[in-house]
């Protein structure tokens, strides 16, 4: 149990002040963390507050600005860069989001030599993407879909691709669903480690479908967003990938890198690359039905100019039971002699664990293991190996960062972090510097968080590098509601979840829940963090239980619980927050008649579908921005799932687990359906088609569309929605306002 | 030792079509990007376009853009040029070289094309 | 697209003498994106200075590029009898690649 300090002290009570709409609104309570600019093995660069870039060194304890905040302000610079030559510095501004990851950006380059931005030769704008070589001055941006280099920034460019063309060839950056559901990236191109080769992928999308709605905006007509999106079984885009020798790139040309012979065969994807050594690259394939993988070392072949991918260094990951991997494939970490690799997968037992991989996956050798997860792995240095799993004190919503030493025979392991500050730190993630000379621990909670400078040897810890005292200064006179993390068994099933409980609960009165869902594949909504949000204002000031609860197809506890949802989503993932609820009304502190459930994109499919499963319990509900039917969402992210919507395939489980199946359903509970007219991502289409249903069914329910808003429904619009769905869940819950 | 050898230049009608091939010996030919080059009688030289190594990507002049198609048989180590369309100022030794936009190491001999009525 | 300006139109030199060829770009190029290649009559052109500066396989040293920008030079510190041919100087930085109407070095 992790109990917040409610300081219920009745000297104190008269001073404390419960949790308003407008602090959650205003981000009163927000916190801050630290993550050092890393440029070598002891010196970090970090924006101070008043917005210099400062050079930090560890080791002799100076610090100096290299870049002032006048020169920032010069050009309203929002981001930096500084070349790895320490030379230059491109300055970012003109920030403008595209989607979850891209945006556009123009880009300034400072001569720090000179202390002037360089003339001639600028860069064009808007940017797609721009970055620095890892070694020296050089750049690769994306303009127009097309990839440029730079020798160095006043040079004139060199034009690497010429058949860029908007929503149909993408150069360097990724079409809209590699980025959401793929790569996670704005970009699609891979400097070597000694910047001699540039590797990028293009992605034709010429034959995709394409997603149109409407962006009112404020002239006399709407324009129309056009989105090549492939929606569960459409045609996918096509992904090509390329190196280049970036030393006389105008001779040789880009070299197509051969696609593995078990892949090429039918559709498939490209999901990461990494290189090892300016001569050896890896890259990640996947079929488009997502449970096989092929990781396939290349090798450059200095004779022939060209890129050798021998079958013997393809590497095969194959799941049974599931797809491929949690939610992406895991992507591997290269050892020293550049050939053999650590690498995240399920173990025989079904749980995620390190294995080291030297010549075959078959011959693989398990470096961790136990009921418990490897989450990510950090660093490989020749000596450590650093990762972070939920192993400790069998609580799979913590994060903690642990090394293992691969130097010594048999390798020992050790928590880095779990005794660090126990209480209040039990989630972490971590920022290594080169060689992880040092690294930064950021703690997310439960307590407020944390961060810290450690030395890489010793685990010792060197400085506070942000502790955010003045939020804990501000919290001291408010009274924050209680939070307890715990699990049901329930027919060999562990249901994970939080309680958040109003300050001064008592277990001996009733109290209206609400439930918070998500509950999407290979996610985690029970973890060990700190938030002051919504949800902690309805329990601290209008006294509302909140839970959280992790059922079948959440993460990071192993296979079984992982893919129970494989190929029939929206039934587990329901019935366990069914399940949780009627559990919870067992324990006697709530309010049968006063439950209600909500949720945002797959959490509005899942609370949708709660409220029409005929059980009576919930008397009232919130979807935001909902899946309706899973033949309207993406294809990377669906299929891997839920197979193909064909007949020979999936296509009875693609219509029965629609929303709009169950419309009837809806009509003893009070619905609030809500979603952005721009939602790029979950398209309105969803709610519009629930909204028909109910129609057609003469079923009553209360919506809220957000005009000219994507799927974050963010600015003006989040505080509009946390006071409609506020006054709506007060008039189920019959609270006063 | 390295070498490429045009064929299939000609006379030509203006309007009419004709492939040239450049068979390429001496070295991994399906590793290196591919290029024809052209002089006209008495003139200097002209690029007239590029396909990368395995024949995935291809470019052009403008001049020939929509007319010449740059093809390759990596099989065969034949580099190809279909030209359609073709005109009275098409007409010249056309060359193919090693190389994709410049550091053209290796030539052909070159094949005569006479484009006239 | 890059237009590439040789001078001298033709240079009347004697063997034995050292050789200056310049080639003006319209726009910036940089000596990585620029090659120089020789031309005798009824051959194929040869390449000299390949991207970068650097001479290309079984160039003799007399043969030298410089230069960057828009500014290139091809020198021959000593011309050789069979040095007299057309000399084109060729840019690879922008799409089409373009090469300069040649310099004719003739004998004397």
């Known amino acids: 149990i992790v109990l917040r300090p409610s300081r219920v002290h009745n000297s104190e009570e008269n001073t404390m002040r419960a949790l308003t709409l407008k602090d959650i609104l205003n981000g009163t309570f927000s916190y801050k963390t630290f993550f050092p600019n890393w440029i070598s093995g002891q010196e970090y660069l970090h924006q101070s507050a008043d917005n210099n870039i400062v050079l930090y060194n560890i080791e002799t304890g100076q610090s100096y600005t290299i870049l002032s905040n006048r020169t920032m302000k010069s050009v309203n610079a929002s981001n930096y860069g500084l070349s790895p030559d320490r030379q230059f510095v491109y300055l970012e501004s003109d920030y403008s989001k595209l989607w979850r990851y891209s945006y556009t950006a123009t880009y300034y380059i400072y001569d720090l030599s000179n202390g002037e931005f360089v003339r001639g030769n600028e860069l064009p704008r808007p940017i797609q993407y721009l970055c620095w070589s890892p070694v020296g001055s050089k750049l690769a941006y994306v303009y127009q879909n097309n990839i440029y280099l730079k020798q160095r920034p006043g040079d004139p460019p060199f034009q690497i691709t010429f058949n860029g063309r908007e929503n149909k060839i993408f150069n360097g950056i990724p079409d809209w669903v590699y980025e959401e559901e793929m790569l996670a990236t704005k970009y699609a191109l891979w400097w070597s480690p000694n910047g001699k080769f540039l590797a990028y992928a293009e992605f034709n999308d010429t034959d995709i479908p394409v997603i149109a709605y409407s962006y009112y905006g404020d002239e006399q007509y709407p324009r129309t967003i056009n989105i090549p999106y492939p929606k569960a079984g459409a045609k996918n885009p096509v992904v090509r990938i390329f190196i280049i020798d970036t030393t006389y790139p105008a001779y040789v040309g880009p070299q197509e890198v051969p696609v593995p012979a078990m892949i090429a065969s039918s559709d498939y994807y490209f999901s990461w690359l990494t290189w090892v050594t300016d001569e050896r690259v890896c890259l990640q394939w996947l079929k488009r039905v997502q449970n096989v993988s092929v990781l396939s070392i290349c090798d450059f072949r200095e004779d022939w100019q060209t890129w050798d991918c021998p079958k013997t260094q393809e590497h095969i990951e194959e799941s049974r039971t599931g797809w491929a991997g949690g939610f992406f494939v895991s992507t591997p970490v290269f050892s020293y002699d550049a050939i053999s690799y650590y690498k995240i997968f399920s173990d025989k037992d079904g749980y995620k664990h390190i294995h080291y991989i030297k010549d075959t996956v078959e011959n693989a050798i398990q470096i961790t293991s136990g009921k418990w997860e490897a989450i990510n792995i950090f660093r490989v240095t020749q000596d450590s190996l650093f990762y972070s799993s939920n192993e400790f004190e069998e609580y799979p919503g913590r994060r903690n960062i642990y090394r293992i030493s691969i130097g010594s025979y048999p390798p020992s392991k050790k928590c880095v972090t779990c005794h660090l500050r126990k209480e209040r730190c039990q989630y972490y993630t971590a920022s290594f510097s080169d060689y992880a000379k040092y690294y930064a621990l950021v703690c997310y909670g439960p307590g407020i968080p944390i961060s810290t400078l450690h030395d890489g040897r010793t685990d010792q810890e060197i400085k506070i590098l942000e502790e955010n005292k003045e939020l804990e200064n501000a919290l001291k006179n408010i009274q924050l509601p209680k939070e307890e993390i715990k699990k049901l068994e329930v027919d060999e099933i562990t249901l994970w979840y939080k309680m958040i409980l109003p300050p001064q609960f008592d277990r001996s009165k009733k109290y209206p829940l609400l439930i918070q869902v998500y509950g999407g594949p290979c996610s985690q909504s029970v973890r060990s963090v700190f938030a002051v949000n919504w949800i902690s204002y309805l329990a601290s000031k209008e006294g509302m239980v909140i839970a959280l609860v992790d059922g079948r197809g959440t993460a990071f506890q192993g296979d079984k619980l992982l893919y129970a949802v494989y190929r029939k989503l929206g039934v587990y993932e329901v019935e366990d927050q069914i399940t949780a609820v009627r559990k919870f009304i067992e324990m006697g502190f709530i309010d049968e008649k006063r439950i209600a459930i909500w949720g945002w994109s797959y959490g509005g499919y899942v609370s949708s579908l709660a409220l029409a499963s005929g059980t009576g319990l919930f008397k009232c509900g919130i979807a935001v921005a909902p899946v309706s039917s899973w033949e309207y969402y993406a294809s990377v992210y669906t299929e891997r799932f839920m197979g193909l919507p064909t007949k020979d395939d999936n296509l009875e489980h693609y219509k029965n687990s629609t929303v709009m199946a169950r419309a009837e359903y809806f009509r003893n509970v009070d619905y609030l359906l809500i979603h952005g007219t721009a939602d790029d991502n979950v398209h309105f289409q969803n709610s519009a088609q629930i909204a028909k249903a109910l129609v057609n069914a003469q079923v009553d329910f209360q919506a809220m569309w957000y005009s000219d808003q994507n799927h974050g429904l963010s600015g003006l619009s989040t505080n509009h929605l946390y006071t409609h769905m506020t006054h709506f869940l007060k008039q189920c819950f019959s609270l006063s306002d | 030792e390295v070498q490429l050898l045009e064929s299939g230049g000609g006379l030509v009608q203006p309007g009419g079509s004709l492939r040239l091939s450049c068979a390429a010996s001496?070295?991994?030919?399906?590793?290196?990007?591919m290029s024809w080059v052209r002089q006209a009688p008495g003139k200097g030289l002209e690029w007239v376009s590029a396909i990368i190594s395995s024949g995935g990507l291809t470019y052009y002049a403008d001049s020939v853009k929509g007319r010449f198609t740059i093809s390759r048989d990596n099989s065969k180590n034949t580099l190809y040029l279909q030209m359609n369309s073709l005109r009275a100022e098409d007409t010249a030794v056309y060359y193919c070289?090693?190389?994709?936009?410049?550091?053209?190491?290796?030539w052909g001999q070159g094949t005569l094309v006479t484009v006239s009525s | 697209e890059i237009v590439l300006t040789q001078s001298p139109g033709t240079l009347s030199l004697s063997p034995g003498e050292r050789a200056t060829l310049s080639c003006r770009a319209s726009?910036?190029?940089?000596?990585?994106?620029l090659a120089w290649y020789q031309q005798k009559p009824g051959q194929a052109p040869r390449l000299l200075i390949n991207v970068g500066s650097r001479r290309a396989t079984g160039i003799p040293d007399r043969f030298s590029g410089s230069g960057s920008g828009t500014d290139f030079t091809l020198t021959i510190s000593r011309l050789e009898p069979e040095d007299f041919a057309v000399y084109y100087c060729q840019q690879g930085i922008m799409l089409p690649p373009t090469f300069g109407q040649g310099t004719k070095v003739e004998i004397k």
């Open positions: 001496g070295f991994t030919f399906s590793s290196y990007a």
């Open positions: 726009q910036s190029v940089t000596s990585s994106y």
């Open positions: 070289a090693k190389g994709w936009f410049g550091g053209f190491n290796y």
